[in-house]
């Protein structure tokens, strides 16, 4: 079989900024890692920034995570909570282009969803979203 | 339809699962009008960190 990457990049989307977190193979040490749905491919999810008033633009820094070269799991050095969210969009049709971040359909839908979440979770604690995956309903 | 799966990140202690879900559900009507996205079947769960990609995914099929 042909090879794709063993690591991938996800984008944390937030107001006016994108904090990029790279997933790497377990043997590597990385200061900040978010597991990706695309863990065997080099795909980077396109980041999206919403336009906000300068006064309300919130530049977030993501607390570092530490990991070791051992098989043990990395530990949080400062606190970030992650939530897995799943939902159906009943008025859209899945097609194969939603498996590829370089397609227009994927990018448009990702952009709308990113904007939507920035609207929903305006409070200061929101760091962003990552690992968007689309599948047929 | 399209199923969307994603991970949300918050500073620890600023929100819980229930509030994540509640706020999202409250926004569904506006999502339909603003983005033309008709949202249903919302499911939210904690992702224990660190987590494996596999366990992260298989919880939700």
């Amino acid at each position: 079989a042909s090879g794709s990457a063993s690591g991938s990049a996800s984008t944390l989307v937030h107001n006016g900024t994108s904090a990029r977190a790279t997933t790497t193979p377990a043997s590597k040490s990385t200061p900040f890692s978010i597991p990706s749905h695309h863990s065997d491919t080099p795909t980077t999810l396109a980041s999206h920034s919403t336009k906000t008033d300068a006064s309300s633009t919130h530049h977030s820094s993501v607390p570092p995570l530490t990991s070791s070269n051992h098989s043990t799991s990395p530990q949080l050095s400062t606190g970030v909570s992650f939530f897995f969210l799943s939902f159906h969009i009943s008025n859209l049709q899945f097609n194969s282009s939603l498996e590829d971040p370089s397609t227009d359909y994927y990018q448009e839908l990702q952009r709308d969803i990113s904007e939507m979440f920035l609207q929903i979770y305006k409070q200061g604690g929101f760091l962003g979203l990552s690992n968007i995956k689309f599948r047929p309903g | 339809s399209v199923v969307v799966q994603l991970t949300l990140a918050f500073r620890e202690g600023t929100i819980n699962v229930h509030d994540v879900e509640t706020q999202f559900n409250q926004y569904k009507t506006e999502a339909a009008s603003r983005y033309n996205l008709t949202i249903s079947d919302v499911s939210v769960s904690d992702v224990p960190f660190p987590f494996s990609a596999q366990s992260h995914h298989h919880h939700h099929h």
């Epitope: 065997d40 795909t43 282009s97 498996e99 590829d100 397609t103 | 990609a53 298989h58």
Partner: antibody
């Protein structure tokens, strides 16, 4: 390492059907798409269709609609392609290619189908 | 259907040469183009995805670029293992289509 292992070569008679498999391994997720592509002897590549593993979602090239059926078995991480009403021009190597965060990321080794009376 | 016109259909080159293969798309496909490598008896391998992104494990001598509707695969310094057939593939719209292929042979 991600691998796509396809079933062995087939020799079939004109008018018959053939069903081939594409088993994926080395990947943690059960949700992804499989594209099917064929290559006739000495020719280029031709897209047949797509199935999202574990669902009944399919897309077909109009040229093959009605003769091709794509199915999958999530528990076996396997996709299947059945081609019916075979004719000599269907003699080809049939490839599966799976998505891995983007389309056509990994390819199987191919299944040679020979249509001969 | 979107047509991909790939040129040349074959070329002879020597180790160390710079090789350029072009695909022209009949309609706008954005960046939704892959480059594939096929060697006899081996699985097809994707080299480039999304026009210019290099797959992991693919040597950096391979690169992809775009100018309007023309998409180019460049091998900066041809190596013995690069003698193969190369295909472009568009996935902007179904049915997905391939270029006719370019066979790179030893001069």
């Amino acid at each position: 390492e991600v691998q796509l292992v396809q079933s062995g070569a087939e020799v079939v008679k004109p008018g018959a059907s053939v069903k081939m498999s594409c088993k994926t391994s080395g990947y943690t997720f059960t949700s992804y798409g499989i594209n099917w592509v064929r290559q006739r002897p000495g020719q280029g590549l031709e897209w047949i269709g797509y199935i999202y593993l574990g669902s009944d979602y399919t897309e077909y090239n109009e040229k093959f609609k009605g003769r091709v059926t794509l199915t999958s078995d999530t528990s076996a991480s396997t996709a299947y392609m059945e081609l019916s009403s075979l004719r000599s021009e269907d003699t080809a190597v049939y490839y599966c290619a799976r998505s891995a965060g983007s389309l056509f990321g990994y390819w199987g080794q191919g299944t040679l189908v020979t249509v001969s009376s | 259907d979107i047509q991909l016109t790939q040129s040349p259909s074959s070329l002879s080159a020597s180790v160390g040469d710079r090789v350029t293969i072009t695909c022209r798309a009949s309609q706008d496909i954005g960046i939704t183009l892959n480059w594939l490598q096929q060697k006899p008896g081996k699985a097809i391998k994707r080299l480039i995805y999304a026009t210019s992104s290099l797959d992991s494990g693919v040597p950096s001598r391979f690169s992809g670029s775009r100018s309007g509707s023309d998409y180019t695969l460049t091998i900066s310094s041809l190596q013995p293992e690069d003698f193969a057939t190369y295909y472009c593939l568009q996935y902007a719209s179904s049915p997905y289509t391939f270029g006719g292929g370019t066979k790179v042979e030893i001069k």
